[in-house]
């Protein structure tokens, strides 16, 4: 799934070289991109007699007229003059149409069309502009994730896009959290998906000339509950010098709320284990996963007494997991000496 939005201008549609005045109806919020002449030697664009700068929201650049998002004040007469002469290559009037970002998705898409519209380039049925962005057809997504479906398209007149779920008009009104329809991105975004979001999502792209559709298949996976998972190799066996500070790290993964304890194995009456077979331990730190830095055990200014076995114990409503590591503390005067520590223990 694509993580980021990106501005996507309409494909550059080259107006014909007919010099009679032509009209083009543009929906509010719609990006405009028109060509005039060849890219490098393209003509200069003028609006109401003033030449458009190569930068800004409305710009004339390399023969292109580009409007990032059409506003009412952008309506008017636009001329494209050939470089180095006063030859009119393009003479058109942009007229304000209905808003593309209207929240009323029940509108008949045909209502965006002006039957008297005289377009400056041939009519064209909708087509996919970036089919490679639509190749991922089957989506299996863990519950809680965000899903984004895109159907970038173009055509003339500019097509409208509608979304269906399992063949029915889909506006997201019955969906907790709703949906985001980004018409300029031809996208549908659903945050925090749940099992009821499963199904077939169809984008239906239409204009006066024709229509195209594409299906995305969405499955929402519910993770089966499990006891906490501890990252392999953590906590790690550590060797430190007397007086130094030590950090032991434990990485815990758990869907259900986990509870974490740091334990130090101790010896009582010369024995490490009680009559019940469980080791003697001292609880050093206890908290839930939301506590800051609960997954790190800090040992300050360690002494020889701090040497030994440490265990990270994590539990949730399903069960317990633990992993252990050994801390070896070296005397300051002989830092080259190392003791062989047992391997860290891992649960199954």
């Amino acid at each position: 799934l694509e993580a980021s939005e990106e501005v996507e201008l309409e494909p550059c549609l080259a107006p014909s070289l007919e010099q009679q005045e032509q009209e083009l109806t543009v929906a509010l919020g719609q990006p405009v991109r028109l060509c005039c002449g060849r890219a490098e030697r393209g003509g200069h664009w003028y609006k109401e007699g003033s030449r458009l700068a190569p930068a800004g929201r409305v710009r004339g650049w390399r023969g292109r007229l580009e409007i990032a998002s059409f506003l009412p004040e952008d309506a008017g007469r636009y001329l494209c003059l050939a470089r180095g002469s006063m030859i009119v290559l393009q003479n058109l009037t942009l007229i304000t149409g209905d808003s593309l970002t209207s929240s009323n998705d029940d509108e008949d898409p045909k209502s965006h069309r002006d039957p008297s519209n005289r377009h400056s380039y041939p009519q064209q049925a909708p087509y996919w502009t970036h089919p490679q962005r639509m190749e991922k057809k089957l989506h299996a997504v863990p519950a809680g994730n965000t899903v984004k479906f895109r159907c970038p398209a173009a055509g003339n007149p500019t097509p409208t896009i509608r979304w269906l779920k399992d063949g029915q008009a889909f506006h997201g009104e019955n969906r907790i959290g709703g949906i985001r329809l980004r018409h300029q991105h031809w996208s549908l975004v659903m945050e925090s998906v749940v099992p009821s979001d499963r199904g077939t999502y169809t984008c239906l792209v239409e204009n006066a000339v024709g229509s195209i559709r594409y299906n995305y298949l969405l499955d929402v996976l519910e993770r089966s509950p499990h006891r906490p998972i501890l990252q392999a190799g953590l906590p790690a066996n550590t060797t430190a010098v007397v007086g130094s500070d030590v950090e032991l790290l434990c990485k815990v993964y758990s869907d259900a709320q986990p509870h974490i304890q740091w334990l130090k194995h101790i010896v009582i009456n010369g024995s490490s284990f009680g009559a019940d077979g469980f080791p003697y331990v001292q609880v050093l730190k206890t908290a839930d996963i939301n506590s800051s830095e609960v997954e790190v055990l800090y040992l300050r200014n360690v002494s020889a007494e701090d040497a030994g076995e440490y265990t990270c114990l994590a539990g949730n409503s399903i069960g317990l997991s633990y992993q252990s590591a050994w801390l070896t503390v070296l005397p300051e005067e002989d830092p080259t000496w190392t003791a062989a520590a047992p391997e860290a223990r891992y649960t199954d």
């Epitope: 190749e135 057809k137 089957l138 989506h139 299996a140 499963r198 298949l217 499955d219 929402v220 996976l221």
Partner: antibody, heavy 118, light 112 residues
């Protein structure tokens, strides 16, 4: 290694029923869309049905809609195809296959033969 | 009658290059990627090309795929006797009745 093993095929009379099974191993079964594809003797491949990993969404070819039901038991890593009101034209080798994210049938079983005849 | 159209047969001599076509419509090949399968005699189909032109690991680079508009093709260069098999194209179809998978009728390739 992905393994798919179909079973349950056999001879059945027109109008009868049969249930095919596909035992899967070597991958996280519940994460994958699965499908059934059939091939009549001496003919080409025909898609029959597909199901999402959770089992929440099912898809059918028009030729079997209303007669066949696809299902799965993720706890048993098994895919099923319940075939009712069988017709002679349903005679085929039935393959189960994994469906990859981008649409292709990635892995196929060896197939099980279903013969519908009186 | 298959939704995707393939020639029923194709042939070539060892070392030759052979191309198999597959034509469809805007609702299938026009909107979706094309996948190719090879079925050797008496065996289950095997994925040969996916997403128009990608080869799964283990498939020799003698096999290549392409797509343009509503048509696709599979090319086999340096033909070998072991390439004699049935070849099928397939794609999802986004028809009005909902998503389904469509196959070509298959092309029987004979290595002369």
């Amino acid at each position: 290694e992905v393994q798919l093993l179909e079973s349950g095929g056999g001879l059945v009379q027109p109008g009868g029923s049969l249930r095919l099974s596909c035992a899967a191993s070597g991958f996280t079964f519940s994460d994958y869309y699965m499908s059934w594809v059939r091939q009549a003797p001496g003919k080409g491949l025909e898609w029959v049905s597909a199901i999402s990993g959770s089992g929440g969404s099912t898809y059918y070819a028009d030729s079997v809609k209303g007669r066949f039901t696809i299902s799965r038991d993720n706890s048993k890593n098994t895919l099923y195809l319940q075939m009712n009101s069988l017709r002679a034209e349903d005679t085929a080798v039935y393959y189960c296959a994994t469906l990859a994210t981008y649409g292709p049938f990635d892995d196929w079983g060896q197939g099980t033969l279903v013969t519908v005849s009186s | 009658q298959s939704v995707l159209t393939q020639p029923p047969s194709a042939s070539g001599t060892p070392g030759q290059r052979v191309t198999i076509s597959c034509s469809g419509s805007s609702s299938n090949i026009g909107s979706n990627t094309v996948h190719w399968y090879q079925q050797l005699p008496g065996t289950a189909p095997k994925l040969l090309i996916y997403r128009n032109n990608r080869r799964p690991s283990g498939v020799p680079d003698r096999f290549s795929g392409s797509k343009s508009g509503t048509s696709a093709s599979l090319a086999i260069s340096g033909l070998r006797s072991e390439d004699e098999a049935d070849y099928y194209c397939a794609a999802w179809d986004d028809s009005l009745s909902g998503p389904n998978v469509v196959f070509g009728g298959g092309t029987k390739l004979t290595v002369l």
